[in-house]
């Protein structure tokens, strides 16, 4: 009786269980009653990452430097090339097919999370008591200067974009 299901790493063809090709190899011909499955290694700059019955290997991804991409992990016969972005840039998608410049946090906002090759800068508004007076992809919100600890008094209140201005205390005669 011909099988209706096959073991792991096998496939059913012409009422027969044939061995799948291992990662890094493609199918040339199915097995027969008398012969094994015939597989062939993928060519240079090609890959297959699973046990398969593919007749063509996939091409390695190209990390195009003109799109701000660079290689994170070189491709092999069993794995695709993994791209990431040049410093200061991040991927526009999970597939990392192109890069965009990291966003800067405007004055009044600080960096909550610094960007990586795959994620953009996350900004947060500076809460009361903190400020940021620059546009930056790295700077967090800074605390207002404590005038008291310097034996000074607040002459000008701080905002989310400016520090407080301290001055000397008025001396009573």
């Amino acid at each position: 009786e011909p099988p209706t299901a096959c073991r792991e790493k096998q496939y059913l063809i012409n009422s027969q269980c044939c061995s799948l090709c291992q990662p890094g190899q493609k199918l040339v011909s199915d097995c027969t009653e008398f012969t094994e499955t015939e597989c062939l290694p993928c060519g240079e700059s090609e890959f297959l990452d699973t046990w398969n019955r593919e007749t063509h290997c996939h091409q390695h991804k190209y990390c195009d430097p003109n799109l701000g991409l660079r290689v994170q992990q070189k491709g092999t016969s069993e794995t695709d090339t993994i791209c990431t972005c040049e410093e200061g840039w991040h991927c526009t998608s999970e597939a990392c097919e192109s890069c965009v410049l990291h966003r800067s946090c405007s004055p009044g906002f600080g960096v909550k999370q610094i960007a990586t090759g795959v994620s953009d800068t996350i900004c947060e508004p500076c809460p009361v008591g903190f400020f940021s007076n620059v546009s930056s992809a790295f700077e967090k919100c800074h605390p207002w200067t404590s005038c008291e600890t310097k034996d000074l008094v607040v002459q000008q209140a701080g905002t989310n974009k400016t520090d407080v201005v301290c001055g000397p205390q008025d001396r009573l005669r």
Partner: antibody
Framework: EVQLVESGGGLVKPGGSRRLSCAAS????????MHWVRQAPGKGLEWVAY????????YYADTVKGRFTISRDNAKNSLYLQMNSLRAEDTAVYYC????????????WGQGTLVTVSS | DIVMTQSPDSLAVSLGERATMSCKSS????????????LTWHQQKPGQPPKLLIY???TRESGVPDRFSGSGSGTDFTLTISSLQAEDVAVYYC?????????FGGGTKVEIK
Amino acid sequence: EVQLVESGGGLVKPGGSRRLSCAASGFTFSDYGMHWVRQAPGKGLEWVAYISSGNRIIYYADTVKGRFTISRDNAKNSLYLQMNSLRAEDTAVYYCARQDGYRYAMDYWGQGTLVTVSS
Amino acid sequence: DIVMTQSPDSLAVSLGERATMSCKSSQSLLNSGNQKNYLTWHQQKPGQPPKLLIYWTSTRESGVPDRFSGSGSGTDFTLTISSLQAEDVAVYYCQNDYTYPLTFGGGTKVEIK
């Protein structure tokens, strides 16, 4: 027998150009990726550039990006390195090496050709 | 870029003795997809081009004597010559084959004591 033979080396003035060639024989050239690697006199090895078997993928070292161009002609079993705006620090023996689709390593190297950049 | 650091710079060993050299990479060379470490060793004899010795950290290239062995994983790798022969006098380079730019260590020069 696998053979890689580089040619085109010689004395070049700073700012000048040179084109290196690598003639391949003893294997199916179009099935292999190719690299250029250089070695300054008395120094270690420095990777320069890579081109995939089908010309689709090209990578360069930052030190040569924008000045050097790697190319190949599979019909002529030849690899090339066009070197422009040459500097004294480009003085080296230039090797071509092949990369197969199994090991993904440089498994055969040519004998090298010496490029000297000097006024 | 991945920085490859080899030690020692040179090594003098008696014939028949063991020679061991180290190679450290500034980041892991482990391919997450196939779990192979893409660390390659090349041998360069005086006046000759480099020759592939070992790939994937420990797999000897065809024709390489079994006195040569490679080991390690992640960022720390070792090349061992179990019984040094006169023809093993050379500079040995480790190489990052994991990512571009491909980078080489500075080399370890092996001499006869």
